[in-house]
Interface confidence: low
């Protein structure tokens, strides 16, 4: 929005709220809100909440250093997770747990259940809970190619830490391959980094799920936190609508909320699903800070540009040298939601829902 | 721009051209075009053209996989390069060129001459010309810490190739460190990747500048293409204006130039510096395809949203659920230019000058 006229803030907010109503339905490819007649009583199942929280954590982690995201991600992604095959499975017997490596295997039938076709997969992350680490450790991740062949994927320098920490590796390409192939069990290897000169590195890092001798409740908790694949995929019924492009990213904000800036700025707008949209079908979250961009972006006639003060305004008001600059979102963040389809709770992530900053463009 | 009214295309173009006049001066922090009284006769020096071409190559390489760029990069960056110390220098005698590594050293006084203060450095790339490669090679880059200590930086999987190819490694952080420290010579090591199991890897890749026995003209050509650091930095005189944020990026285009789309689209606009701006002071290029965004982005009232056809329009016309969607640039590319300040030719890169695609936002 870019205008010098007096703005009816209420109308702008109402239009933004109404646009969000359509946007959410559109992203979920729903013509109308889903019926709530089949929803079971009581709170959301623990497993669903755990999944929702994993997704929220992923979002929080990314806002600090966001990944480029295909704009085919306009459409919501269904989020699922597949736990590592437990270490007492016979597959582990074939791979000696050496001093420099640990192995993690996954059942591809579970992966295919979650993502029926490779093209539907938007992102796959291998999540490992690393326990406290006394020394810095350089680790490498490999993909199983055949019984005795491993392909290097990526590496990570792990800083010493007194507290456990989730590690995340992007393994989208690998999981896409696995979904295309016929194998039953596929795996990764996490190894110490060895240079050609110093080859005696030991894997010092302790990954949750590999410590032996746990019993009872402790073993269950331990098992829940064992390595897993976090998958984000387009549901099959939305597959035909896929298209691709890319999305921009940036940083900013605090200034706008601590001033009454008249020019282009991000304006606070909290959407309460129940109060603002009359929706009870989204179970988590209860609402979110959608925000919006508002304020003029003055066009600067460069007839005045012999004055360096005027030139300095370009960066703020018209950095792209537009013929009619406009106040639009710069940094956007996704929103994970939980809702029911019939009796089945779903966790989905909606891209580009939260406006963090604006720019004149 | 977002309007349904009849548009005076000529006026829009004129406003875009005038805005670009101010934008370029603003990015260079010039109140008016620089005086050309000191410019020497004849063509640009070879070294300047080579630098300009390096910068252009960098741009071409990036549009395929653009790097996130701080928006302090709004202001132009001066581009310089520092060649690797030649291999006959005694520093190389201390490091045996083993079968799995090659070494590259740089004179930090040359770096400091190019970038007087670490904070001014925006980006540093290590550029290596790799010659043809028969097999796939996994290589690792290390930074020299002390005579016998090396710190891992990054790795690259090199595909087999019949033709030479420039490799680029982002070493911004390392060069910033070097600029902060007092050392005279600093270096990198390129090594074959060795896993803890298979340790007999040989560095198969042939990097230009390390082949011995060349003479005369061939040696000169070879020397020019030896490894170098490409540096982009804020000139000292513009340093006080530094501020930070982040910039967005995306992909798209061809459709708009081959259609008569009435809605939001990228529109062709070539700026000839001499004809359109009356400027003779930019030596390279003579002009550029600035382009601009134009066309309506209809607001979709979700009162109509019971119709799934209407919902499908959200992705195209109002993906961000704006109260007043606007046609703005999505993918922008930088523009390197060559101009003189007094007798001194400068190569500078101006960010976000070329509009490659537009979006409703």
């Amino acid at each position: 929005l870019s205008t010098s006229k007096t703005i009816d803030m209420e109308l702008v907010k109402r239009k933004r709220i109404e646009a969000i109503r359509g946007q959410i339905l559109s992203k979920l490819r729903l013509a109308s809100p889903p019926s709530q007649g089949e929803v079971p009583p009581g709170p959301l199942p623990e497993a669903v909440l755990a999944l929702y929280n994993s997704t929220r954590d992923r979002v929080a982690g990314e806002s600090a250093e966001p990944e480029p995201e295909p704009e085919a991600d306009y459409y919501a992604k269904e989020v699922t997770r597949v736990l590592m095959v437990e270490t007492h499975n016979e597959i582990y017997d074939k791979f000696k747990q050496s001093t420099h490596s640990i192995y993690m295997f996954f059942n591809t039938s579970e992966l295919r259940e979650a993502v029926p076709e490779p093209v539907l997969l938007s992102r796959a992350e291998l999540r490992l809970l690393r326990l406290k680490l006394k020394v810095e450790q350089h680790v490498e991740l490999y993909q199983k190619y055949s019984n005795n062949s491993w392909r290097y994927l990526s590496n990570r320098l792990l800083a010493p830490s007194d507290s456990p920490e989730w590690l995340s590796f992007d393994v989208t390409g690998v999981v896409r391959q696995w979904l295309s192939r016929g194998g039953e069990i596929e795996g990764f290897r996490l190894s110490a980094h060895c240079s050609c000169d110093s080859r005696d590195n030991t894997l010092q890092v302790d990954i949750n799920g590999f410590t032996t001798g746990r019993r009872g409740d402790l073993a269950t908790i331990h098992g829940m936190n064992r390595p897993f694949l976090l998958l984000m995929a387009t549901p099959l019924e939305r597959a035909q609508h896929l298209q691709s492009s890319r999305h921009r990213r940036a940083l900013d904000t605090n200034y706008c909320f601590s001033s009454t800036e008249k020019n282009c700025c991000v304006r606070q707008l909290y959407i309460d699903f129940r109060k603002d949209l009359g929706w009870k079908w989204i179970h988590e979250p209860k609402g979110y800070h959608a925000n919006f961009c508002l304020g003029p972006c003055p066009y600067i006639w460069s007839l005045d540009t012999q004055y360096s003060k005027v030139l300095a305004l370009y960066n703020q008001h018209n950095p792209g040298a537009s013929a009619a600059p406009c106040c639009v979102p710069q940094a956007l963040e996704p929103l994970p939601i939980v809702y029911y389809v019939g009796r089945k709770p779903k966790v989905e992530q909606l891209s580009n829902m939260i406006v963090r900053s604006c720019k004149c463009s | 721009l977002s309007t349904s009214k009849t548009i005076d295309m000529e006026l829009v173009k004129r406003k875009r051209i005038e805005a670009i006049r101010g934008q370029i001066l603003s990015k260079l922090r010039l109140a008016s075009p620089p005086s050309q009284g000191e410019v020497p006769p004849g063509p640009l020096p070879e070294a300047v053209l080579a630098l300009y071409n390096s910068t252009r190559d960098r741009v071409a390489g990036e549009s395929a996989e653009p790097e996130p760029e701080p928006e302090a990069d709004y202001y132009a960056k001066e581009v310089t390069r520092v060649l690797m110390v030649e291999t006959h220098n005694e520093i190389y005698d201390k490091f045996k060129q083993s079968t799995h590594s090659i070494y590259m050293f740089f004179n930090t006084s040359e770096l400091r001459e190019a970038v007087p203060e670490p904070v001014l450095l925006s980006r540093a790339e290590l550029r290596l010309l790799r010659l043809k490669l028969k097999v796939e090679q996994h290589v690792e880059l290390y930074q020299k810490y002390s005579n016998n200590s090396w710190r891992y930086l990054s790795n690259r999987l090199l595909a087999p190739s019949d033709s030479p190819e420039w490799l680029s490694f982002d070493v911004t952080g390392v060069v910033r460190q070097w600029l902060s420290r007092g050392g005279e010579i600093e270096g990198f090591r390129l090594s074959a990747h060795c896993s803890c199991d298979s340790r007999d890897n040989t560095l198969q890749v042939d990097i230009n500048g390390f082949t011995t026995g060349r003479r005369g003209d061939l040696a000169t050509i070879h020397g020019m293409n030896r490894p170098f650091l490409l540096l982009m930095a804020t000139p000292l005189e513009r340093a006080q204006h530094l501020q930070s944020s982040r910039h967005r990026r995306a992909l798209d285009t061809n459709y708009c130039f081959s259609s008569t789309e009435k809605n939001c689209c990228v529109r062709q606009l070539y700026i000839d510096f001499r004809k359109d701006l009356g400027w003779k002071w930019i030596h390279e290029p003579k002009g550029y395809h600035a382009n601009f965004c134009l066309g309506p982005c209809p607001y979709i009232w979700s009162l109509d949203t019971q119709y799934s056809k209407v919902l499908a329009l959200y992705n195209q016309h109002n993906p961000g659920a704006s109260a007043a969607p606007c046609c703005v640039p999505q993918a922008l590319e930088p523009l390197p230019i060559v101009y003189y300040v007094g007798r001194k030719p400068k190569v500078e890169q101006l960010s976000n000058m070329i509009v490659r695609s537009c979006k409703c936002s």
Epitope: M9, E10, K13, Y255, C256, F257, S258, S259, T260, E261, R267, Q268, Y270 | -
Partner: antibody, heavy 121, light 107 residues
Framework: EVQLLESGGGLVQPGGSLRLSCAAS????????MSWVRQAPGKGLEWVSA????????YYADSVKGRFTISRDNSKNTLYLQMNSLRAEDTAVYYC??????????????WGRGTLVTVSS | DIQMTQSPSSLSASVGDRVTITCRAS??????LNWYQQKPGKAPKLLIY???SLQSGVPSRFSGSGSGTDFTLTISSLQPEDFATYYC?????????FGGGTKLEIK
């Protein structure tokens, strides 16, 4: 302890000038917009002026525009109100208030005790 | 400028009573409304912000509601320390404006 302490009030003749100060402590001063609010004897509250955290933006009530100037020195954690061309109707207790702008709602979550300004001949 | 009108201007009530004070804006201000309490000789104190959000440390007997032009402050069960003057304030646009105040007295 988080607190605001006003000073500089007193008796001044019509047409005269006065400079109020507000010393802030116990919080990151530069992170907050600040404001002056006044209250004439026996009357209600009246917003006077506000300033953004950096000092880059200032806002005034019509009744004081052109006569009063709000400013801040973040290095000294101090807010100021320079009052010129004072009138009898400016007589009031002047409160310094911290603005919590989270959400853009601009509410005054911390107040000083106030300083009395009396304009009289 | 946005005018804020409070009613009643004064009110007598007893300990334990439920009390409602209303505030009306001259134009829609969404939920950009705050409530303050002031006791004689003291500085005002924030009770409610954004129409319905309770400021931390404020007893839960205070609640705010409303949106647009009409707002209410409710004290569910009046306590002796609640006898004071109450002000509403809009932050929809500058100039920021306060209501004239409602003086709550002991009956």
């Amino acid at each position: 302890e988080v607190q605001l302490l006003e000073s500089g009030g007193g008796l001044v003749q019509p047409g005269g000038s006065l400079r109020l100060s507000c010393a802030a402590s116990g919080f990151t001063f530069s992170s907050y917009a600040m404001s002056w609010v006044r209250q004439a004897p026996g009357k209600g509250l009246e917003w006077v002026s506000a300033i953004s955290g950096s000092g880059g933006s200032t806002y005034y009530a019509d009744s004081v525009k052109g006569r009063f100037t709000i400013s801040r020195d973040n290095s000294k954690n101090t807010l100021y109100l320079q009052m010129n061309s004072l009138r009898a109707e400016d007589t009031a207790v002047y409160y310094c208030a911290r603005v919590d702008s989270s959400g853009g709602y601009w509410y005054f979550d911390l107040w000083g005790r106030g300083t009395l300004v009396t304009v009289s001949s | 400028d946005i005018q804020m009108t409070q009613s009643p201007s004064s009110l007598s009530a007893s300990v334990g009573d439920r009390v409602t004070i209303t505030c009306r804006a001259s134009q829609s201000i969404s939920s950009y409304l705050n409530w303050y309490q002031q006791k004689p000789g003291k500085a005002p104190k924030l009770l409610i912000y954004a129409a319905s959000s309770l400021q931390s440390g404020v007893p839960s007997r205070f609640s705010g509601s409303g949106s647009g032009t009409d707002f209410t402050l409710t004290i569910s069960s009046l306590q002796p320390e609640d006898f004071a003057t109450y002000y509403c304030q809009q932050s929809y646009s500058t100039p920021l404006t306060f209501g004239g105040g409602t003086k709550l007295e002991i009956k």
